[in-house]
């Protein structure tokens, strides 16, 4: 059974590709799923020789390897687009890169913004 | 080279009890979930139980509720069924498998044959 | 309870395209129940093919494919090859921590 998870409402929104897909750039945004399935936030960004590029972040449905998930970590050694999902409200404000193979722990801290909420 | 290694199986009574383990190398076991699959003789794979990366959370197929229990030491890198009240319908071989995002078992052990017979 | 279904056995020629399909008792399967599917051999581990309806795992030939064809989950095969000759599962996550396997389908390739 699922025990004390914490539960998803809202997430931080980010699209780097928000022209293209006709959508808002950044702001917060509301989770909605199937009742009786937890929700997630996510993050996912490049890596370009140290300089961080975000591609997304938002709202992700119920995904078993994402359950009981503080913090949003990535392990994948060197992918193309780095990912992470975590539980609880804006828990991918923050976002941290851990390699499997113990390498240096990098945590990347947003910009202070105003975001604005996404229905 | 990710690797899982099953362990414990045996023959046992029925109404005995038995600890498999599983234990991992290869990735970051603490920050992946994991689960138990069985294979009855002859039939298809069924999905037995599963326990997020703190083990805060677990679940279990219908028919093993209440007389398994799954359990995990990240300290260990090890995955644990405990399986009591075993019938001669949990015959089967057991794996354990690694699950990835997007909810799919990416790793898979050999499996270990779990036989209840007297 | 949830039940999933795939066709029991299937044959292909050499070289000829099978589709494998995988649906369920309540509904219409989508992306969110991440479907993936495996490949066994007897006496084998299973091997995993596709997840997420439609990615190829890593070191997959590109001759398996995923789909949704109309309210099921899908498996093709292009070009089928003797050593394509197994068992094929499907998987649905339904939430909540529950996957729940198809009954499988034994191919073979004559």
């Known amino acids: 059974s699922g025990r004390g998870e914490a539960e998803t409402r809202e997430c931080i929104y980010y699209n780097a590709n928000w022209e293209l897909e006709r959508t808002n750039q950044s702001g917060l945004e509301r989770c909605e799923g199937e009742q009786d399935k937890r929700l997630h936030c996510y993050a996912s960004w490049r890596n370009s020789s140290g300089t961080i590029e975000l591609v997304k972040k938002g709202c992700w449905l119920d995904d078993f390897n994402c359950y009981d998930r503080q913090e949003c970590v990535a392990t994948e050694e060197n992918p193309q687009v780095y990912f992470c999902c975590c539980e609880g409200n804006f828990c991918n404000e923050r976002f941290t890169h851990l390699p499997e193979a113990g390498g240096p722990e990098v945590t990347y801290e947003p910009p202070p913004t105003a975001p604005t909420l996404l229905t | 080279e990710v690797q899982l290694l099953e362990s414990g199986g045996g023959l046992v009574q029925p109404g005995g009890s038995l600890r498999l383990s599983c234990a991992a190398s290869?990735?970051?076991?603490?920050?992946?979930?994991m689960s138990w699959v069985r294979q009855a003789p002859g039939k298809g794979l069924e999905w037995v139980s599963s326990?997020?990366?703190?083990?805060?959370?677990?679940y279990y197929t219908d028919s093993v509720k209440g007389r398994f229990t799954v359990s995990r030491d990240n300290s260990r890198n090890t995955l644990y069924l405990q399986m009591n009240s075993l019938r001669a319908e949990d015959t089967a071989v057991y794996y354990c498998?690694?699950?990835?995002?997007?909810?799919?078992?990416?790793?898979w052990g050999q499996g270990t044959l779990v036989t209840v017979s007297s | 309870q949830t039940v999933v279904t795939q066709e029991p056995s299937f044959s292909v020629s050499p070289g000829g395209t099978v589709t494998l399909t995988c649906g369920f008792n309540?509904?219409?399967?989508?992306?969110?129940?991440?479907p993936s599917w495996y490949q066994q051999t007897p006496g084998q581990a299973p091997r995993t093919l596709i997840y997420?309806?439609?990615t190829r795992s890593s070191g997959v030939p590109d001759r398996f494919s995923g789909s949704i064809l109309g309210n099921k989950a899908a498996l093709t095969i292009t070009g089928a090859q003797a050593d394509d000759e197994s068992d094929y599962y499907c998987?649905?996550?339904?939430?909540?921590?529950?996957?729940?396997f198809g009954g499988g389908t034994k191919l073979t390739v004559l």
């Open positions: 326990i997020s990366v703190t083990g805060g959370s677990t």
């Open positions: 309540s509904g219409s399967v989508s992306t969110s129940y991440y």
């Open positions: 997420n309806t439609n």
């Open positions: 998987v649905l996550y339904m939430g909540s921590g529950i996957h729940v």
């Open positions: 290869g990735f970051t076991f603490r920050n992946s979930a």
């Open positions: 498998a690694k699950v990835y995002y997007y909810s799919f078992f990416d790793y």
